[in-house]
C-alpha cells in the first residue's frame, strides 16, 4: 500500500482543516488508514482522524482544530496499521480556504434597484472577518449566456445593481463566494443560490 498523491490540506481558519490524498489503488480509507495530527508545541496531544473515501483511491480527512492562530503548525502522519506511509507538516494560515458566505438574500422592493445581501461567515473576532472580499455570480435560468460576475472589493457584504441591467420578466439566480487577499487564500465554495423574478418598469419612450 502506497501513497500516490501526497495529502494536501486547506483550513477554514477557524475550526476545520480538510486533507485529501490518493492511494495507489482502491482503498477502504476508514478501515485501513489513520491520519494523526499534532500541534507543534510542548505537551500537545496527538489527534487521530479516521478518513473517509473520496472516490475509489481517494481519501479525505476533516481535522478538528481549536481557533487557528497564524503561528500554528501541525505535524501529519499517515498510517496504515503499524506502517508509516507518509509524514509531513501543515501550517493552516498558509493554506486557507474561507468558509462560504451564507444567508444570501435578494431585496427587490427598492425602486428599480436590486440589493443583494449576505452574511460574513466568520465571527467578529476572527482575523478573516475584516479581510474578506466577494464575488457575486448572477445568471439567467432561461439563457445560459446571460451569466455575470460582480467583484465586491469593499468589506460590506452587499451589492446594489440596477434592475435594468438584467432582463425584465425572467427568473435569475445568484450565489456568492469569498476570498481573503491578506492570506492569499483560495476562493471559498459558492453559497447556496437564491432565485428571484426580475421585473421593473421600462422607461416610457416618446415617439
Amino acid at each position: 500500500m502506497k501513497v500516490l498523491q501526497e495529502p494536501t490540506c486547506v483550513s477554514d481558519y477557524m475550526s476545520i482543516s480538510t486533507c485529501e490524498w490518493k492511494m495507489n489503488g482502491p482503498t477502504n480509507c476508514s478501515r485501513e488508514l489513520r491520519l494523526l495530527y499534532q500541534l507543534v508545541f510542548l505537551l500537545s496531544e496527538a489527534h487521530t482522524c479516521i478518513p473517509e473515501n473520496n472516490g475509489g483511491a481517494g481519501c479525505v480527512c476533516h481535522l478538528l482544530m481549536d481557533d487557528v492562530v497564524s503561528a500554528d503548525n501541525y505535524t501529519l502522519d499517515l498510517w496504515a496499521g503499524q506502517q508509516l506511509l507518509w509524514k509531513g507538516s501543515f501550517k493552516p494560515s498558509e493554506h486557507v480556504k474561507p468558509r462560504a458566505p451564507g444567508n444570501l438574500t435578494v431585496h427587490t422592493n427598492v425602486s428599480d434597484t436590486l440589493l443583494l445581501t449576505w452574511s460574513n461567515p466568520y465571527p467578529p473576532d476572527n482575523y478573516l472577518y475584516n479581510h474578506l472580499t466577494y464575488a457575486v455570480n448572477i445568471w439567467s435560468e432561461n439563457d445560459p449566456a446571460d451569466f455575470r460576475i460582480y467583484n465586491v472589493t469593499y468589506l460590506e457584504p452587499s451589492l446594489r445593481i440596477a434592475a435594468s441591467t438584467l432582463k425584465s420578466g425572467i427568473s435569475y439566480r445568484a450565489r456568492v463566494r469569498a476570498w481573503a487577499q491578506c492570506y492569499n487564500t483560495t476562493w471559498s465554495e459558492w453559497s447556496p443560490s437564491t432565485k428571484w423574478h426580475n421585473s421593473y418598469r421600462e422607461p416610457f419612450e416618446q415617439h
Partner: antibody
Framework: QVQLVESGGGLVQPGGSLRLSCVAS????????MNWVRQAPGKGLEWVSY????????YYADSVKGRFTISRDNAKNSLYLQMNSLRDEDTAVYYC????????WGQGTLVTVSS | DIQMTQSPSAMSASVGDRVTITCRAS??????LAWFQQKPGKVPTRLIY???SLQSGVPSRFSGSGSGTEFTLTISSLQPEDFATYYC?????????FGQGTKVEIK
C-alpha cells in the same frame, strides 16, 4: 490524561449570584478555547458561553447575555462563569467543555435556583 | 440564531435494528454539525463531527451524513449499549445550538 473539574454549584435564590469554576489538567490550558454547557433536570443540552484561546473573545447564548460572564485564568488553569441575576430557569447541571467542539467534558456542577 | 430540529424526539427499537435520527438546521450550516451520545447520569460524548467524520474510538456502526440543512445519524445495527439520548449540534455560528435530543429506548 485530560481532566476538567467543575465546582461552585449550589442552591441560590432568584436574583442571586454564583461563580462556577472549572480546573483543567492533563493539557496546556492556555492553548485551548473553552465552553460552558448546561442541562436542566430531565431536559436537553444548551450551550451557554465560549471563550477563545486565540483572541480572548467571548460569546453567549441569548438566554444568559448580560447576566453571565465567562473568564479564564491561564496561570491557574481555570475557567470561570460568573452568574448574576439568576432565574428559576437557570437551574441546571453546568459543564465545562473543551474545544474543539466539546472534545472533553467535566462531570458537571448542579446549580439550583429556588426560593 | 440557527434552530436545530431533531426527529423523532423519542423512539423504541430492538437490538439489531437500523436506527436513523435526523436533524434539520433553520439555515445552511455546511458540514459544521456534530452528534453526541448521552447515557443517563453520564457526560455527553462526541460520536460524529463535520457531519460525517467518525470520532476516533467510536464503533463503525455509527455514521453521519448530510450537508447544508439536512443531516442524519445512522446506527447500522443497534447494540444494547446504544440505548441513550442523541443530540446534534451546529457550530457554524454563534450562538451554538443543540437539537432537542432523541431518546432511543428498548422496544
Amino acid at each position: 490524561q485530560v481532566q476538567l473539574v467543575e465546582s461552585g454549584g449550589g442552591l441560590v435564590q432568584p436574583g442571586g449570584s454564583l461563580r462556577l469554576s472549572c480546573v483543567a489538567s492533563g493539557f496546556t490550558f492556555s492553548h485551548s478555547s473553552m465552553n460552558w454547557v448546561r442541562q436542566a433536570p430531565g431536559k436537553g443540552l444548551e450551550w451557554v458561553s465560549y471563550i477563545s484561546r486565540a483572541t480572548g473573545a467571548v460569546y453567549y447564548a441569548d438566554s444568559v447575555k448580560g447576566r453571565f460572564t465567562i473568564s479564564r485564568d491561564n496561570a491557574k488553569n481555570s475557567l470561570y462563569l460568573q452568574m448574576n441575576s439568576l432565574r428559576d430557569e437557570d437551574t441546571a447541571v453546568y459543564y465545562c467543555a473543551r474545544e474543539p467542539v466539546f472534545d472533553y467534558w467535566g462531570q458537571g456542577t448542579l446549580v439550583t435556583v429556588s426560593s | 440564531d440557527i434552530q436545530m430540529t431533531q426527529s423523532p424526539s423519542a423512539m423504541s427499537a430492538s437490538v439489531g435494528d437500523r436506527v436513523t435520527i435526523t436533524c434539520r438546521a433553520s439555515q445552511d450550516i455546511s458540514n459544521y454539525l456534530a452528534w453526541f451520545q448521552q447515557k443517563p447520569g453520564k457526560v455527553p460524548t462526541r460520536l460524529i463531527y463535520a457531519a460525517s467524520s467518525l470520532q476516533s474510538g467510536v464503533p463503525s456502526r455509527f455514521s453521519g451524513s448530510g450537508s447544508g440543512t439536512e443531516f442524519t445519524l445512522t446506527i447500522s445495527s443497534l447494540q444494547p449499549e446504544d440505548f441513550a439520548t442523541y443530540y446534534c449540534l451546529q457550530w457554524s455560528s454563534y450562538p451554538r445550538t443543540f437539537g432537542q435530543g432523541t431518546k432511543v429506548e428498548i422496544k
